[in-house]
């Protein structure tokens, strides 16, 4: 019988008392085979973290800073359940740390030196740790003691709770630096008042502070937010302009064998019986003998944290950067206006080899990081382990939902002004063998399908989106008799046709021979009835253009396209017979790396792009013999995006809507995780 006990860690007598009450009340409402609570008392949150890591306890609720401690080795804990605030219809699990300024003040984030600052309090998250952590490497040396460095950075501050004797400049704007509401500039509202009164130039608070203090929109319009990319935005655009997105209060557990499903089952049942306005005799979110015991008194309920989400992703790149800077106190020696090497994310060992060769030829401007799937690469870019990669539009969508931005687009047509003219896109097509003359778009049910990969544009999002509109369900593996759609569940019929050996079967990388455009076409040639690819795939792999044994004798005339009106056309008539127009592949990165990735990639394509004529004796960035490694092989150049610099603008309204409709069919664990952070 599996042990269904969750050992909750309590950090005080009062918490232990509430825990015992929690345990007893849960016993009274949950059947004996359901989850139960046991209580473990420790002296501090750090002791609780260690106890969970050592399997002496299972769960505890922590503030963001402690979630970071819990994640660090050797603890390796992960977030499993989040408290939410506000309503069930619009649950808030995060708040945003922001930098508020007056509208007419005219400086940016990178011009804060010498300004006057208002903080909620020394050592507090939004008011100190996050802004000072992010500014850490701009502080004058020596950076220890930190208070002295901050005092020398700003021309005057109010940082309640600071030592006014040792660091008088930190108390210059609020004499005495009182650590309570007796100091008019203490806390969120106090820091905002410090800005409003004109004492300070910038206030570090949370996004809701300005709304709580100024009910009138006209008054709020006198203020703006400083963004990390050195722009400003209106105060209601905090989701796109903040210093960090911070989880409020989170239950953590072990990463391996952490009982996360059991903890959720317990807390979900607990909120049903003892949540807000549920029971008089015991209330989860109330602390008669103290404040915020076990859970925050202001919480309204719990939400399950998606399993794909580790602590780094949950806390977010900015927050982790800020806290790491404060804790480790290390800064790069290079001047910050110089670009560091771009860490390119390579999928599996084939791309890694090409990336390594690029790295050698770039003389260190490019470094390489490996991952097994595109989603793993996107996650690495999110958390700073990697910086950039080129993605199919379907993954540009996921990357965008995860906060990444497109920076350059692949162009596939030769033109005089390639780098300045991003193209409208390529065509997603359905290819069949000419010999299968009875096959049309309308009778694909029961046929064998070949896809580039799950989540990709031409191979999945476009054809499956169209199919979904027809069949109104997501069971595509029942619609086709079998197929190869790399990235599907291994036991799915959509992995049956795949050719990868062992663990590589149906993997969404080049270890699976039927992965990608060329792979999907090969799948059609060897086993399938229909392949969903791009309009250039057939000509690129026929007429001897692909020397691989399976392709070298293929003839373009032996294949036809399926049109949406039920007819068929020759391959070259793709402009009048396609499923949809697809946005070109694009390079994505984090917002903070956008300028450097843009600069370095433009240099790299001038050195190794399509201007290189002899690829047998020189490194060619856009060549890998039909394998589309790192970039599509038909890339002519990487083009500027001009104003199409967000994923929505880049992909276009129509495609974003189409992928949004397919979301209900999504198996993307990363998309689920990122949507949790930003619904």
């Amino acid at each position: 019988v599996p042990d269904k006990t969750v050992r909750w860690c309590a950090v005080s007598e009062h918490e232990a008392t509430k825990c015992q009450s929690f345990r007893d009340h849960m016993k009274s409402v949950i059947p004996s085979d359901g989850p139960s609570v046991a209580c473990v008392k420790k002296a501090s949150y750090l002791d609780c973290i260690r106890a969970i890591a050592a399997n002496e306890a299972d769960a505890v609720t922590l503030d963001a800073g402690l979630v970071y401690d819990a994640y660090l080795a050797p603890n390796n804990l992960k977030p499993v359940v989040a408290e939410f605030y506000g309503s069930k219809e619009d649950p808030q699990t995060f708040y945003y740390a922001v930098a508020v300024v007056k509208k007419d003040s005219g400086f940016q984030m990178n011009q804060l030196r010498g300004k006057k600052s208002c903080h909620t309090g020394l050592g507090r998250s939004a008011g100190w740790n996050i802004p000072i952590g992010l500014l850490y490497c701009d502080l004058p040396e020596p950076r220890k003691p930190l208070e002295k460095a901050v005092a020398n950075f700003f021309s005057g501050s109010c940082a309640p709770c600071a030592d006014g004797t040792d660091f008088p400049q930190l108390c210059q704007l609020c004499p005495g630096c009182g650590c309570s509401t007796l100091n008019q500039y203490f806390g969120y509202s106090g820091a905002f008042k410090c800005l409003k009164d004109g004492a300070g130039d910038v206030a570090f608070v949370k996004h809701s502070t300005i709304f709580e203090n100024l009910a009138n929109k006209a008054d709020r319009d006198q203020y703006e937010l400083l963004c990390l990319d050195n722009t400003r935005k209106p105060v209601d655009e905090y989701k796109d302009c903040h210093l960090a997105q911070v989880p409020s209060h989170t239950v953590v557990a072990r990463s391996m064998g952490g009982k996360e499903d059991l903890i959720w089952e317990l807390l979900n049942q607990a909120q049903e019986h003892f949540g807000k306005d549920k029971s008089k005799e015991f209330q989860l979110f109330s602390s008669p003998h103290g404040k915020d015991l076990l859970f925050k008194d202001s919480a309204h309920g719990f939400l399950k944290v998606p399993p794909r989400m580790d602590a780094k992703m949950y806390l977010g790149y900015e927050y982790v950067t800020a806290i790491r800077n404060l804790r480790e106190g290390t800064c790069p020696e290079a001047p910050t206006d110089e670009c560091k090497p771009v860490k390119w994310c390579a999928l599996s060992h084939h791309e890694r080899l090409k990336c390594d060769e690029w790295s050698v030829n770039s003389v260190g401007k490019i470094e390489c990081v490996s991952a097994e799937t595109t989603e793993d690469c996107i996650a690495k870019i999110m958390n700073g382990e990697a910086d950039a990669m080129s993605l199919d539009g379907g993954f540009v969508y996921i990357a965008g939902k995860c906060g990444l931005v497109p920076v350059l687009a692949e162009n596939y047509n030769k033109s005089d002004n390639c780098e300045d003219t991003p193209e409208a896109g390529y065509f997603a097509i359905a290819v069949v063998k000419k010999s299968a003359s009875d096959l049309t778009w309308d009778n694909l049910k029961g046929k064998k399908s070949c896809h580039t990969a799950v989540g990709r544009t031409a191979g999945w999002n476009i054809p499956m989106g169209l199919l979904y509109n027809k069949i109104n369900h997501c069971r595509f593996d029942e619609f086709f008799s079998e197929g190869c759609a790399p990235g599907s569940k291994k036991d799915s019929s959509l992995c049956k046709l795949c050719m990868g050996s062992g663990l590589n079967l149906c993997e969404p990388n080049n270890k699976e021979g039927y992965y990608g455009y060329t792979g999907a076409f090969r799948c059609l040639v060897e086993k399938g009835d229909v392949a969903f690819v791009k309009h250039q795939t057939v000509p690129q792999n026929t007429g001897g253009k692909n020397p691989d044994p399976w392709a070298k004798n293929l003839n373009e005339k032996d294949y036809e396209l399926l049109c949406l009106d039920g007819t068929r056309k020759p391959v070259e008539e793709y402009a009048n017979c396609h499923l949809a127009r697809a946005p070109n592949h694009a390079v994505v990165t984090r917002k903070d790396k956008e300028a450097c990735v843009h600069k370095i990639l433009r240099q790299q394509q001038h050195l190794f792009g399509s201007n290189v004529t002899d690829c047998s004796g020189n490194f060619c960035l856009f060549r890998s013999e039909t394998k589309d490694l790192l970039f599509r092989d038909d890339t002519v150049c990487l083009a500027k995006l001009h104003d199409r610099n967000t994923y929505e603008k880049y992909l276009g309204e129509e495609y974003v809507k189409a992928v949004g409709n397919l979301r209900k069919c999504s198996t993307s664990s990363l998309l689920e995780a990122c949507t949790f952070r930003r619904p």
Partner: nanobody
Framework: QVQLVESGGGLVQAGGSLRLSCVAS????????MAWYRQAPGQQRELVAG???????HYADSVKGRFTISRDNAKNTLYLQMNSLEPEDTAVYYC???????????WGQGTQVTVSS
């Protein structure tokens, strides 16, 4: 395709030196990029050092200042001079010429380097 044969490995004390050679069966003069990789037991194969046809070099952070890569096109040979060896350098060392077909996993037998403390 050019065949590559590595040699020069062996057992050496920490702080010692070794020079690895990689002889090609054909001309390397027109080969764009050549490199040394290494693979320790249970680890992924990793890039150690690379050199372009024009002589530009690139090194993994862990070997910078200790290892030197060079090529002699007349002798069709790639070299890796390894100084101040550390136990962490223990691995099988391979050379590659990055043929255009990155996806064809052609590797020689490599040469074992063991650094004892």
């Amino acid at each position: 395709q050019v065949q590559l044969v590595e040699s020069g490995g062996g057992l050496v004390q920490a702080g010692g030196s070794l020079r690895l050679s990689c002889v090609a069966s054909g001309s390397i003069a027109s080969i764009a990029t050549m490199a040394w990789y290494r693979q320790a037991p249970g680890q992924q194969r990793e890039l150690v050092a690379g050199i372009t046809r024009g002589g530009s070099t690139h090194y993994a952070d862990s070997v910078k200042g200790r290892f030197t890569i060079s090529r002699d096109n007349a002798k069709n040979t790639l070299y890796l001079q390894m100084n101040s060896l550390e136990p962490e350098d223990t691995a099988v060392y391979y050379c590659t010429d990055y043929s255009r077909r990155y996806y064809e996993d052609y590797w020689g037998q490599g040469t074992q380097v063991t650094v004892s403390s």
